[in-house]
């Protein structure tokens, strides 16, 4: 465990996912990720981020919403929603029933 180079401040975050080894984790930022896999209910995971900060800037879609924040336990009470699916455009020849 060599001495690591100095880096930005750490934050402590709520950890709620199958990967958590404890009730909190420590990282560069806190995350909440809401994911909906095909045919399943959306699942919300809370944890820590250290890599790929660009994911924090992604726009919500109907399948994933990625939220990041930078203060202690800031991800604890955050609830996310997915982008509403676009209603299918009406097909010609249908009678709307």
């Amino acid at each position: 465990d060599p001495v690591k180079p100095s880096r930005g401040p750490l934050v402590t975050c709520t950890c709620e996912s199958p990967h958590c080894k404890g009730p909190t984790c420590r990282g560069a930022w806190c995350t909440v990720v809401l994911v909906r896999e095909e045919g399943r209910h959306p699942q919300e995971h809370r944890g820590c981020g250290n890599l790929h900060r660009e994911l924090c800037r992604g726009r919500p879609t109907e399948f994933v919403n990625h939220y990041c924040c930078d203060s202690h336990l800031c991800n604890h009470n955050v609830s996310l929603v997915l982008e509403a699916t676009q209603p299918p455009s009406e097909q010609p020849g249908t009678d709307g029933q």
């Epitope: 001495v3 401040p9 958590c20 080894k21 404890g22 909190t24 984790c25 420590r26």
Partner: antibody, heavy 120, light 107 residues
Framework: QVQLVESGGGVVQPGRSLRLSCAAS????????MYWVRQAPGKGLEWVAA????????YYADSVKGRFTISRDNSKNTLYLQMNSLRAEDTAVYYC?????????????WGQGTMVTVSS | DIQMTQSPSSLSASVGDRVTITCRAS??????LAWFQQKPGKAPKSLIY???SLQSGVPSKFSGSGSGTDFTLTISSLQPEDFATYYC?????????FGGGTKVEIK
């Protein structure tokens, strides 16, 4: 290599004070939470106190609350335990431990311990 | 406070034996459990965290399992250096609490 070395133990009379130190080396001290755990002679392990990596939060066992104070100096890579109003039941080996950088409260490295004897 | 109860408090085993130690929490702690080994006159050594994840450098003869309230530590083939006292510890919530220990002795 990663090392924690406790010091400051000794024999002290009931009601008196003592300050323990834990010198850290070989890792980035300011990235880890730190802990004191004690072990009375012939007994099991007892958690005493915890402090966040930045010193912003501190936690204590009920048995020492109001008498012991945990602190740290990240510029000196040192953890402290100020023990006041000592009692015979505080007699124990005191260990410092650090947690994993990613997982708070998960101990991975321990010091060798320092003995505190409270006796008149 | 969460009470941690280990069993047995001591056991005798021979080199090569498979040894299992159990730890029970007084309430659910998910998988937030650690195991430590301590030899006489020495500091504890961290073995397992997250109920089943091995600490760096710990040999694979040690394994952990369980979730919720019931946990086990298994040593697949006991070696002379494994005779020691083993402690479980929960870190689901403060105060952090340890089990009373299991002393593994030579038969």
């Amino acid at each position: 290599q990663v090392q924690l070395v406790e010091s400051g133990g000794g024999v002290v009379q009931p009601g008196r004070s003592l300050r323990l130190s834990c010198a850290a080396s070989g890792f980035t001290f300011s990235s880890h939470g730190m802990y004191w755990v004690r072990q009375a002679p012939g007994k099991g392990l007892e958690w005493v106190a915890a402090i966040w990596y930045d010193g912003s939060n501190k936690y204590y066992a009920d048995s020492v609350k109001g008498r012991f104070t945990i602190s740290r100096d990240n510029s000196k890579n040192t953890l402290y335990l100020q023990m006041n109003s000592l009692r015979a039941e505080d007699t124990a080996v005191y260990y410092c431990a650090r947690d994993q950088e990613q997982w708070p409260d998960v101990f991975d490295i321990w010091g060798q311990g320092t003995m505190v004897t409270v006796s008149s | 406070d969460i009470q941690m109860t280990q069993s047995p408090s001591s056991l005798s085993a021979s080199v090569g034996d498979r040894v299992t130690i159990t730890c029970r929490a007084s309430q659910g702690i998910r998988n937030y459990l650690a195991w430590f080994q301590q030899k006489p006159g020495k500091a504890p050594k961290s073995l397992i965290y997250g109920a089943s994840s091995l600490q760096s450098g710990v040999p694979s003869k040690f394994s952990g399992s369980g979730s919720g309230t019931d946990f086990t530590l298994t040593i697949s083939s006991l070696q002379p250096e494994d005779f020691a006292t083993y402690y479980c510890q929960q870190y689901n919530s403060y105060p952090l609490t340890f089990g009373g220990g299991t002393k593994v002795e030579i038969k």
